[in-house]
């Protein structure tokens, strides 16, 4: 939980923050986990600790490993781990997946690409920006503070963007590069990981024995037309059609609806003549699309008939 992946390129600066946070007044000790050797704080060292920060100026492939940081306060100690990997510089333009920071999406209305991790460094504007290794030129591109703004975003603007800046430490300059993918969302539509609106996770639904009951599985998948999206019910992890209980049926087809502009699908599960054994089953509402699968579980409980006797 308190471990963080960090990566960089050899001969570039890399600064890593301790995953455990504390007040500025707390002391932070850093160790190289494999040897339990303390990281020095003297700035004359190539690798040194500076409070919450661990600095590699510059980084070397041999620096790769797990570093332990201990945040010490008068009343407690907190331990965190920084898993650092330093890679050799690529000779070609292609940036491998393992050097990529999180993908950001943009649209005509919002096209900011933030330079990852830059807040850890002592840098001065302007940033240099590259797309697929080509320096960005033209009035559509504006380097503003720690982010790039693209005017009139088009689908062609999707790609890998690299920011390059100089970190200054005691008068010495070190280069830093960071790359992330930028995807362009058409304002007319997009898809996202399914969001189940109903039922709530681990919901208990009260039913009356001998009566009919309906359960609705409802999920939203994005805005506009959705490609390969579905909602369905499962019983004890099995498709309704395979479960073999004719009293329990899924509605044919999925009803499409729009909620706050989002494309949603509903699927109703009908249970006829509810029986005691139905209360023992696990009912799963599943919503899936190309982003993945989300599952909400429902259980049935007996609704106590109202006692009319005083």
């Amino acid at each position: 939980k308190f471990s963080k992946q960090s990566w960089g390129l050899e001969n570039e600066a890399l600064i890593v923050r301790c995953p455990r946070q504390g007040k500025p007044s707390y002391t932070v000790d850093w160790y190289y986990s494999q040897t339990n050797k303390s990281i020095p704080t003297q700035e004359r060292n190539r690798v040194f600790a500076s409070g919450q920060l661990l600095k590699f100026l510059p980084a070397a492939v041999a620096d790769s490993g797990i570093y332990t940081c201990i945040v010490r306060s008068p009343t407690f100690n907190r331990t965190g781990y920084a898993n650092v990997t330093i890679y050799k510089k690529q000779s070609d333009c292609n940036v491998p997946d393992y050097l990529m920071y999180s993908t950001v999406s943009g649209s005509e209305k919002n096209s900011k690409i933030y330079c990852p991790t830059i807040d850890l460094y002592n840098w001065t504007a302007p940033l240099e920006w590259f797309k697929n290794c080509q320096a960005l030129q033209g009035s559509r591109y504006r380097a503003h503070k720690s982010f790039l703004v693209i005017d009139n975003v088009m689908t062609e603007d999707a790609g890998d963007y690299t920011c390059k800046f100089i970190h200054n430490e005691n008068g010495a300059n070190y280069s830093v590069t960071a790359t992330r993918s930028f995807t362009v969302k058409d304002e007319q539509g997009f898809s996202l990981f399914p969001v189940i609106g109903a039922p709530a996770q681990n919901e208990i639904k009260e039913v009356e024995i001998g009566k009919n009951a309906n359960l609705t599985c409802s999920a939203c998948f994005g805005k506009g037309t959705q490609f390969l999206a579905a909602v369905l019910w499962q019983l004890n992890g099995t498709k309704i059609t395979d479960f073999g209980e004719p009293r329990i049926q899924q509605e044919e087809g999925q009803n499409q609806s729009f909620s706050n502009g989002l494309a949603c699908l509903d699927m109703v599960l009908r249970i006829a003549d509810v029986k005691e054994e139905d209360l023992l089953l696990q009912y799963d509402c599943l919503a899936l699309n190309l982003h993945g699968l989300r599952r909400h579980t429902v259980r049935l409980s007996r609704k106590n008939p109202i006692d009319h006797h005083s």
Partner: antibody, heavy 126, light 107 residues
Framework: EVQLLESGGGLVQPGGSLRLSCAAS????????MNWVRQAPGKGLEWVST????????YYADSVKGRFTISRDNSKNTLYLQMNSLRAEDTAVYYC???????????????????WGQGTLVTVSS | DIQMTQSPSSLSASVGDRVTITCRAS??????LNWYQQKPGKAPKLLIY???TLQSGVPSRFSGSGSGTDFTLTISSLQPEDFATYYC?????????FGGGTKVEIK
């Protein structure tokens, strides 16, 4: 290495049946949406069917609905296409292909057919 | 269903030529457009997805553009290994549909 390997093609008479298999390896099978795409001799590509491997939701082209059944065996990492009531117009090379099985998801390619098998020829003729 | 129309259906070109293939959708499909290359006797290969993003390992001489209904695949400098048939495909809605293909032949 990411790989799809089809088998089961052959010559069958009109009205007959055939079951195609596609063995998948090198990626997490249950993360994928698996597909069958066919190509009649000298013609273009036509999507046939899709299944979500994780839960088995299925989609079919109108031209095969009610005659073809797509299924999978997660324990064997294998995709199937059961073809019944075959017609001459079903003659084609049948490819299995994945959607959303690769690291390309990071870059939004989840809706493209990103991995293809080598194909298996189905000939329907008397 | 969304119809995809490719043009031309075939073209002749020489090594080093710049080649452009167009694909038109019967309705707006935003950027949900993919391009494939197929050589005789082989399976199709994904070249470009999301209208303009190059699939990993595909040479940079290939590029895609367009949004909405009109899309273009461009080969900036045709190489001997590029002689093949190219297909566009929409993934905006089910069923996914392909264009009829464009055969690029040696002049």
């Amino acid at each position: 290495e990411v790989q799809l390997l089809e088998s089961g093609g052959g010559l069958v008479q009109p009205g007959g049946s055939l079951r195609l298999s596609c063995a998948a390896s090198g990626f997490t099978f249950t993360d994928a949406w698996m597909n069958w795409v066919r190509q009649a001799p000298g013609k273009g590509l036509e999507w046939v069917s899709t299944i979500s491997v994780s839960v088995g939701v299925t989609y079919y082209a109108d031209s095969v609905k009610g005659r073809f059944t797509i299924s999978r065996d997660n324990s064997k990492n294998t995709l199937y296409l059961q073809m019944n009531s075959l017609r001459a117009e079903d003659t084609a090379v049948y490819y299995c292909a994945t959607i959303g099985s690769m690291a390309t998801i990071r870059k939004g390619a989840t809706d493209a057919f990103d991995i293809w098998g080598q194909g298996t020829l189905v000939t329907v003729s008397s | 269903d969304i119809q995809m129309t490719q043009s031309p259906s075939s073209l002749s070109a020489s090594v080093g030529d710049r080649v452009t293939i167009t694909c038109r959708a019967s309705q707006r499909i935003n950027s949900y457009l993919n391009w494939y290359q197929q050589k005789p006797g082989k399976a199709p290969k994904l070249l470009i997805y999301a209208a303009s993003t190059l699939q990993s390992g595909v040479p940079s001489r290939f590029s895609g553009s367009g949004s909405g209904t009109d899309f273009t695949l461009t080969i900036s400098s045709l190489q001997p290994e590029d002689f093949a048939t190219y297909y566009c495909q929409q993934s905006y809605s089910t069923p996914p549909t392909f264009g009829g293909g464009t055969k690029v032949e040696i002049k």
